[in-house]
């Protein structure tokens, strides 16, 4: 049976040319991190972090993605384009695929609220 | 290329203790977890636990909690599974398997216990 | 605890035959994985998430399956495919099928 929890940075908002921190993080179970993968919205790959190969950014991405803090993805330079879901994918052994989900709405407005709280979604 | 080398057959008595060892090559051992399955002659395979090989942490199936120990030698890429106080039932060969979808286990270790 | 049935237990197959081996489970898994074993040989992954070919695998062995049915089917059955197969799934407690031994006539 699978243990763990996925908790998130689950709703957040960042001001548009900002940053902002993907956060996702995995709890209450003994398995072994093999890999994780980010992912956006319409189901491209923005990131991996692989245990043994280390962190991967896609080309289309590498501009404007940094790796971290810890497993986490910063999404730097945000625009408009950049507002909708995010998905972080744990494959361990022996649980298999733990998912967690993010909403990112990137707010043209100065006084975008930065929410950093962590949720289970 | 990625290997896992188990050491040779083992010929014990009951009571006995033996350690059988699984020495990976070819990718970053603490990258995986290790799992040990037994097999009995004639019968499937049965799943026996695994170990952290990050943190070190074995966690055991119920049906080898007791007697089973799984341990590591990091520096030399090596995992262990010791079985202490033998009994016939014992007799089977052992596999180390890499904890992921890549396929990849030892060659086997066969262990005997006999009076 | 998963456990995991296969079906039949014993098949016998001719030369060129299509052939599908099954593995229910009692409750519902997210993957399986196939493995081949021959006598005195370690397991050899065939098919590993259900229906992903394992490198040097023969086109020939495909998998598919949801839920709590899962199947491993052989194309053409040669003479080298004559071997046990077994299904394994993780899911916290990984299990083994009781396993499928494959007859060539």
């Known amino acids: 049976m699978m243990t763990g929890t996925i908790e998130t940075t689950g709703n957040i908002s960042a001001k548009k040319g900002g940053s902002v921190i993907l956060q996702c993080h995995l709890s209450s179970t003994m398995a072994q991190v093999t890999q994780v993968n980010w992912e956006q919205h319409d189901h491209s790959l923005l990131a991996i972090r692989n245990a043994e190969l280390g962190w991967h950014i896609y080309p289309a991405f590498k501009d404007r993605v940094a790796p971290g803090p810890g497993l986490g993805l910063t999404l730097q330079s945000l625009t408009m384009n950049d507002t909708g879901e995010y998905f972080c994918t744990y494959h361990t052994y022996p649980d298999g695929t733990y998912r967690g989900r993010i909403f990112l709405e990137v707010l043209e407005s100065s006084v975008a609220e930065h929410s950093a709280r962590f949720q289970i979604p | 290329q990625i290997q896992l080398v188990q050491s040779g057959p083992e010929l014990k008595k009951p009571g006995e203790t033996v350690k059988i060892s699984c020495k990976a090559s070819?990718?970053?051992?603490?990258?995986?977890?290790m799992s040990w399955v037994k097999q009995t002659p004639g019968k499937g395979l049965k799943w026996m636990g695994w170990?952290?090989?990050?943190?070190?942490?074995?966690t055991y199936a119920d049906d080898f909690k007791g007697r089973f120990a799984f341990s590591l030698e990091t520096s030399a890429s090596t995992a262990y599974l010791q079985i202490n106080n033998l009994k016939n039932e014992d007799t089977a060969t052992y596999f180390c398997?890499?904890?992921?979808?890549?396929?990849?286990w030892g060659q086997g270790a066969t262990l005997t216990v006999s009076s | 605890q998963i456990v995991l049935t296969q079906s039949p237990a014993i098949m016998s197959a001719s030369l060129g035959e299509e052939i599908t081996l099954t593995c229910s489970a009692r409750?519902?898994?997210?993957?399986m994985h196939w493995y081949q074993q021959k006598s005195g040989t370690s397991p050899k992954l065939l098919i590993y998430?259900?229906?992903n070919l394992a490198s040097g695998v023969p086109s020939r062995f495909s998998g598919s399956g949801s839920g709590t049915f899962f199947s491993l089917t052989i194309s053409s059955v040669e003479a080298e495919d004559a071997a046990d197969y077994y299904c394994?799934?993780?899911?916290?407690?990984?299990?083994f099928g009781g396993g499928t031994k494959l007859e060539i006539k």
């Open positions: 398997t890499r904890g992921d979808t890549g396929g990849y």
């Open positions: 394994h799934q993780w899911g916290g407690y990984p299990t």
């Open positions: 170990i952290n090989t990050y943190s070190g942490v074995p």
């Open positions: 409750s519902s898994v997210s993957d």
């Open positions: 070819g990718y970053t051992f603490t990258a995986y977890g």
């Open positions: 998430s259900t229906s």
